[in-house]
Interface confidence: medium
C-alpha cells in the first residue's frame, strides 16, 4: 500500500507548513530570526537549527538585516551596500530608529507613578511601563530620553542609570526574549535587581506587574508595526494586550461567561466555551461566574483558587497531566517535562540536557503511555490545557535557541510555570 504524504504537514505558531518547507521563525520580540532555520520534516515535526556562520576573511565585515551571517563588503550586492535602519510608524507618527517616545492607554493596569515608554528599534516598537522616582520638587520638567518627569538638575538620571535598559541596548538578551505566561508570583528574591527574570513576559490574562517595583523597572510588551499595528484590542471601552483573554460584556446580557475572547494582535477572536456532555456526578451545579456546570463535593472545595471541575476541565478546556523529572549527574542536569494526551494516547516528553547553565541538547520524544509508566523519576506536577502547552512550546523554542549560546539559570523552571493553571485571575476564567 502506497504511503500518502499529502496529509502530513507541520503546525508552527498557528501556520501550516508543507513537508520540506523551510522558513525563518518569527519570534517576538526579535521579529524574523534569520539565524534560525526551521524545516517541516516528513513526520510532521518542526526541526529548527541555528545557522553556523563561516569565518569571514576581511577587516570590517558588514551585517545585513535580512541575512544572518556577516559578509565582506566586496561580496555584497552593490545596490544594498548602504544599510539603513528602519523607522517605525505608531499611531500615525513616524519615529526614527533609536527614537524614544511616550504612548498612552497601552497598559490597563498602569499605576499612577508609572508611564509608558516606547522606543523604535529596527522598525519595531517596544513599549514598557517605567516606574518613575518620587519627585521632590514642585515643578518637575520633561526630559527627552524618558517618559518620567524629573526635577530640574536631575536630568542626568537617564536610562543608563535605570535597571535593565532594554531600550538603549536592544540586543540585551536578558531583557528581550518574551513569551506569554500565566500570572504567578515570583519569589521575592527574583525581583532583587528590579527586573523580573522574564521582563519580556506578558501574562495572557493581564500584565505581570509588581506595584512595588524599583525605579526604572520595565515590563515589556511588543508592538511590531509592520505586522501588527499597536498590538492591543479595545472591547467595551477596555484595552487588552495581545494574548489577553476576557469574557465579553454585552449591554443586553451582561458578562457572557460561555464566550471567551482573546486579543490576537489587534483583532479580538471570540469562541464559545464547550462544556462536557457527561459529568462524573449525577447532579452537576451551575455556579455564578462559570460557564460550565461543576460537580459539587470535596474536591472543588479543597481547591479554592482553581477553575477545574472534577472531570479535569479548566475554563471549559480539557486538561492533561504534566509530569517532570530532574536528574543530575556529573555536573549535567537532564530535565524532562512530559504531557500525557488522550488523543492520540501517548506522552510527549521534552528533554533538556544542561551543563553549567548552557543547553547541550534538547529534543522531543513521543512515547506510549505504557512505556512512560515504566520510566523512573517522573512526578506529576500539574494539569494543563492544550493552549497553555502551546504557549509553553513557543517559549521553549525561544529559550532553547537562547540558552544554547549563553548561560541560563532559571529560564526553564520559570517557563514550566506557564503550565500551572491553579491561579486563574480573580477565580474566574
Amino acid at each position: 500500500e502506497q504511503v500518502k504524504h499529502s496529509e502530513t504537514y507541520c503546525m508552527f505558531q498557528d501556520k501550516k507548513y508543507r513537508v520540506g518547507e523551510r522558513w525563518h521563525p518569527y519570534l517576538e520580540p526579535y521579529g524574523l530570526v534569520y539565524c534560525v532555520n526551521c524545516i517541516c520534516s516528513e513526520n510532521g515535526n518542526v526541526l529548527c537549527s541555528r545557522v553556523r556562520c563561516p569565518n569571514v576573511h576581511c577587516l570590517s565585515p558588514v551585517h545585513i538585516p535580512h541575512l544572518c551571517c556577516p559578509r565582506c563588503p566586496d561580496s555584497l550586492p552593490p545596490v544594498n551596500n548602504k544599510v539603513t535602519s528602519k523607522s517605525c510608524e505608531y499611531n500615525g507618527t513616524t519615529y526614527q530608529h533609536g527614537e524614544l517616545f511616550v504612548a498612552e492607554g497601552l497598559f490597563q493596569n498602569r499605576q499612577p507613578n508609572q508611564c509608558t515608554q516606547c522606543s523604535c528599534s529596527e522598525g519595531n516598537v517596544y513599549c514598557g511601563l517605567k516606574t518613575c522616582p518620587k519627585l521632590t520638587c514642585a515643578f518637575p520638567v520633561s526630559v527627552p530620553d524618558s517618559c518620567c518627569r524629573v526635577c530640574r538638575g536631575d536630568g542626568e538620571l537617564s536610562w543608563e542609570h535605570s535597571d535593565g535598559d532594554i531600550f538603549r541596548q536592544p540586543a540585551n538578551r536578558e531583557a528581550r526574549h518574551s513569551y506569554h505566561r500565566s500570572h504567578y508570583d515570583p519569589p521575592p528574591s527574583r525581583q532583587a535587581g528590579g527586573l523580573s527574570r522574564f521582563p519580556g513576559a506578558r501574562s495572557h490574562r493581564g500584565a505581570l506587574m509588581d506595584s512595588q517595583q524599583a525605579s526604572g523597572t520595565i515590563v515589556q510588551i511588543v508592538i511590531n508595526n509592520k505586522h501588527k499595528h499597536g498590538q492591543v484590542c479595545v472591547s467595551n471601552g477596555k484595552t487588552y494586550s495581545h494574548g489577553e483573554s476576557w469574557h465579553p460584556n454585552l449591554r443586553a446580557f451582561g458578562i457572557v461567561e460561555c464566550v471567551l475572547c482573546t486579543c490576537n494582535v489587534t483583532k479580538q477572536e471570540c469562541k464559545k466555551i464547550h462544556c462536557p456532555n457527561r459529568y462524573p456526578c449525577k447532579y452537576p451545579q451551575k455556579i455564578d461566574g462559570k460557564c460550565c456546570k461543576v460537580c459539587p463535593g470535596k474536591k472543588a472545595k479543597e481547591l479554592p483558587g482553581q477553575s477545574f471541575d472534577n472531570k479535569g476541565y479548566f475554563c471549559g478546556e480539557e486538561t492533561m497531566p504534566v509530569y517532570e523529572s530532574v536528574f543530575m549527574e556529573d555536573g549535567e542536569t537532564t530535565r524532562k517535562i512530559a504531557l500525557e494526551t488522550e488523543r492520540p494516547p501517548q506522552v510527549e516528553v521534552h528533554v533538556w540536557t544542561i551543563r553549567k547553565g548552557i543547553l547541550q541538547h534538547f529534543h522531543i520524544e513521543k512515547i506510549s503511555k505504557r512505556m512512560f509508566e515504566e520510566l523512573p523519576h517522573f512526578k506529576l506536577v500539574t494539569r494543563t490545557t492544550l493552549s497553555q502547552w502551546k504557549i509553553f512550546t513557543e517559549g521553549e523554542a525561544q529559550i532553547s535557541q537562547m540558552c544554547s549560546s549563553r548561560v541560563c539559570r532559571t529560564e526553564l523552571e520559570d517557563l514550566v510555570k506557564v503550565l500551572y493553571l491553579e491561579r486563574s485571575e480573580k477565580g474566574h476564567c
Epitope: 520534516s41 513526520n43 515535526n45 549527574e329 549535567e332 524532562k336 492520540p344 512515547i367
Partner: antibody, heavy 120, light 107 residues
Framework: EVQLQQSGPELVKPGDSVKISCKAS????????MNWVMQSHGKSLEWIGR????????FYNQKFKGKATLTVDKSSSTVHMELRSLTSEDSAVYYC?????????????WGQGTTLTVSS | DIQMTQSPASLAASVGETVTITCRTS??????LAWYQQKQGKSPQLLIY???SLEDGVPSRFSGSGSGTQYSMKINSMQPEDTATYFC?????????FGSGTKLEIK
C-alpha cells in the same frame, strides 16, 4: 569513541545458568539505558529487556521474565545478563545495545555479540 | 505486543538500482520506527530513527518515510556494500519488536 565489549562465547549444558557481560566505555555510562537483544541462528531479533545503569531499574519483555536477570556494576561500567534453566532454545547470539539517549528508544551502538550454545 | 510485518523477505538488486523495503505495524506507532542494517557475521547498525531521521555517518542514499502503521526504507542507488539484512523495529511501546528482516543481495 563508544565501545561495548562483550564477554566471550559460552558452551553450557541444559539446565545450567550463564552470566554474560558487556563493558561500556567512551560515554557517560549511567546516562543511557542498556538493552539486551537475542538473535537465534539465522533468525530475527528479539528484545529481552533493558537496565538503567544509574539506579539498576530494569524492565523485561514478558517472554524473558524468569529467564533473564539484568544487573549493573557501576564501578566497572559493566552490565551483566544472567540466563538460567537453559535449554537448546536459548542457543543464540546475545547483544548488548546502548539506548540512543534520554527517551530515544533506538540502539545506536551494539556490542560484538556473545554466542551461547546450549548442548549436552 | 506490537506485531511487525516486513517485506519482502529477500531481494536482489543491481548496482545503481533503487530498493524499497516496507514494514507494517499492527497499530499506530507515531513515527517511532528505526531501521537497522546487519552485515554477515556482524552486529546490527542503526541507519534510520524516528521513521525518517538519518543516523550520523549513514550515507544519504538511505532514506526512511511513512506514518501511522505503514513505513518504508529506500536505498536510492544500490551499492555492493549495501549487501546485508535489514530490520525494522518499533520503539513506540515495550516490548520493542523487530521485523523478520529483509535479506538484500547484489545481482
Amino acid at each position: 569513541e563508544v565501545q561495548l565489549q562483550q564477554s566471550g562465547p559460552e558452551l553450557v549444558k541444559p539446565g545450567d545458568s550463564v552470566k554474560i557481560s558487556c563493558k561500556a566505555s567512551g560515554y557517560s555510562f549511567t546516562g543511557y539505558f542498556m538493552n539486551w537483544v537475542m538473535q537465534s541462528h539465522g533468525k530475527s531479533l528479539e528484545w529481552i529487556g533493558r537496565i538503567n545503569p544509574y539506579n539498576g531499574d530494569t524492565f523485561y519483555n514478558q517472554k524473558f521474565k524468569g529467564k533473564a536477570t539484568l544487573t549493573v556494576d557501576k564501578s566497572s561500567s559493566t552490565v551483566h545478563m544472567e540466563l538460567r534453566s537453559l535449554t537448546s532454545e536459548d542457543s543464540a547470539v546475545y547483544y548488548c545495545a546502548k539506548g540512543a539517549g534520554a527517551l530515544r528508544n533506538y540502539f545506536d551502538h551494539w556490542g560484538q555479540g556473545t554466542t551461547l550454545t546450549v548442548s549436552s | 505486543d506490537i506485531q511487525m510485518t516486513q517485506s519482502p523477505a529477500s531481494l536482489a538488486a543491481s548496482v545503481g538500482e533503487t530498493v524499497t523495503i516496507t514494514c507494517r505495524t499492527s497499530e499506530n506507532i507515531y513515527y517511532s520506527l528505526a531501521w537497522y542494517q546487519q552485515k554477515q557475521g556482524k552486529s546490527p547498525q542503526l541507519l534510520i530513527y524516528n521513521a525518517n531521521s538519518l543516523e550520523d555517518g549513514v550515507p544519504s542514499r538511505f532514506s526512511g518515510s511513512g506514518s501511522g502503521t505503514q513505513y518504508s526504507m529506500k536505498i536510492n542507488s544500490m551499492q555492493p556494500e549495501d549487501t546485508a539484512t535489514y530490520f525494522c523495529k518499533q520503539a513506540y511501546d515495550v516490548p520493542f519488536t523487530f521485523g523478520s528482516g529483509t535479506k538484500l543481495e547484489i545481482k
